[in-house]
Amino acid sequence: VPRWRQQWSGPGTTKRFPETVLARCVKYTEIHPEMRHVDCQSVWDAFKGAFISKHPCNITEEDYQPLMKLGTQTVPCNKILLWSRIKDLAHQFTQVQRDMFTLEDTLLGYLADDLTWCGEFNTSKINYQSCPDWRKDCSNNPVSVFWKTVSRRFAEAACDVVHVMLNGSRSKIFDKNSTFGSVEVHNLQPEKVQTLEAWVIHGGREDSRDLCQDPTIKELESIISKRNIQFSCKNIYRPDKFLQCVKNPEDSSCTSEI
């Protein structure tokens, strides 16, 4: 008789999850000399230990501490780029502007980017059938708790001017319920962070509105100001040109507004 298995509302663990995590770890440590000391098998063991045999709605930040310890990494605290609902452009940017870092440019973020995982209470099995959905099932699931943990640590490490890329095409340009709005904003350290600079990315080619005046941006400014951090905002009207000018800043067309 097959053992009853909890059916969750979200997709199951990504196929080949263990091998994918390991392969990413090996690749990352090869590319980043400062992380060459990391033993990827130990990283996998710590990752697995955070959720295997545990109820997937009862995961805590504490469960991830061994993994956090192994993945400890120093990034230049004044070169941090946060993002919300515009991951691809943020990553394209840091691929060109190599001295700036998103969370996914760190080892732990790189390992887990776009992956799903969960286990089952009291069994050593990975659940490839379904995992809890944040809204429909529970918020304390392995994936959500992981991103909350690494995002908090990433924001806490930031200093000086912190940049955030926001999606100007969305109805809520700043969303209080996003990871940026619910975790990162509240974990920037006022004693270290002088300014949060928002880059609002325009979607429409002919969109010349000043999206820095959007009510949700004003809400973000209010939250940040109350935390004793200065706020500034820039419209990026032409994201394609913006990237091109990051690649070739000496281009004559890059002196005009982008």
């Epitope: 990504t14 196929k15 080949r16 263990p18 770890c25 090869e30």
Partner: antibody, heavy 117, light 111 residues
Framework: QELVESGGGLFQPGGSLALTCKAS?????????MCWVRQAPGKGLEWIAC???????TDYATWAKGRFTISKTSSTTVTLQMTSLTAADTATYFC???????????WGPGTLVTVSS | DIVMTQTPSSVEAAVGGTVTIKCQAS??????LAWYQQKPGQPPKLLIY???TLASGVSSRFKGSGSGTQFTLTISDLDSADAATYYC?????????????FGGGTEVVVK
């Protein structure tokens, strides 16, 4: 750390066989991708199949699907089963370990399979 | 399936010389390419992975380059111990598949 293949020998056309790759110095309870490759006498390398030791997921070369089966049979062994043997299967069969990111850094010495009547 | 075309099939060069081996993939594979050296009666030995990264313990006389579909292995200051057959291998590791393909091999003869 080493890999050793076994199970080779002389086989009849139409028959079946099972080749074993034994790992020593490391455990397949850790996460690796283990692969089988063959090389006909005087010819090049030909990829057959791989298995992820963590997920158990397998991949096969298109030509190998159906007739070849790769499996992890213990914490130290990976097996390749072959059916409906023909003379074209005569080759040295190697197993190899990928510790991640496609780097096959450990190979066994190979085991020779001869299919002949 | 990805097809790897390796040229030339055989090359001869003098000790101290340079040899260039080319490998072409039938579809773009980024930098997911490895080079192996194989001597008679032995298993292949990993030389280069990620198109240009030297494997541990491999001489810097071996140099890999290229990305996308065109790749090159260059062996400089040729030594008699370099006489062997060299293979390129594409690997494409994703969460859904792990297809691999080897080139046909290039025999390097050192005079």
């Amino acid at each position: 750390q080493e890999l050793v293949e076994s199970g080779g020998g002389l086989f009849q056309p139409g028959g079946s066989l099972a080749l074993t790759c034994k790992a020593s110095g490391f455990s397949l309870s850790n996460i690796y991708v283990m692969c089988w490759v063959r090389q006909a006498p005087g010819k090049g390398l030909e990829w057959i199949a791989c298995i992820g030791t963590g997920s158990g997921d397998t991949d096969y070369a298109t030509w190998a699907k159906g007739r070849f089966t790769i499996s992890k049979t213990s914490s130290t062994t990976v097996t390749l089963q072959m059916t409906s043997l023909t003379a074209a299967d005569t080759a040295t069969y190697f197993c190899a370990r990928d510790p991640g990111a496609g780097t096959w850094n450990l190979w066994g010495p190979g085991t020779l399979v001869t299919v002949s009547s | 399936d990805i097809v790897m075309t390796q040229t030339p099939s055989s090359v001869e060069a003098a000790v101290g010389g340079t040899v260039t081996i080319k490998c072409q993939a039938s579809q773009t594979i980024g930098s997911r390419l490895a080079w192996y050296q194989q001597k008679p009666g032995q298993p292949p030995k990993l030389l280069i992975y990620s198109a240009s990264t030297l494997a541990s313990g491999v001489s810097s006389r071996f140099k890999g380059s290229g990305s996308g579909t065109q790749f090159t292995l260059t062996i400089s200051d040729l030594d008699s111990a370099d006489a062997a057959t060299y293979y390129c291998q594409s690997y494409y590791y994703t969460s859904t598949s792990y297809p691999n393909a080897f080139g046909g091999g290039t025999e390097v003869v050192v005079k």
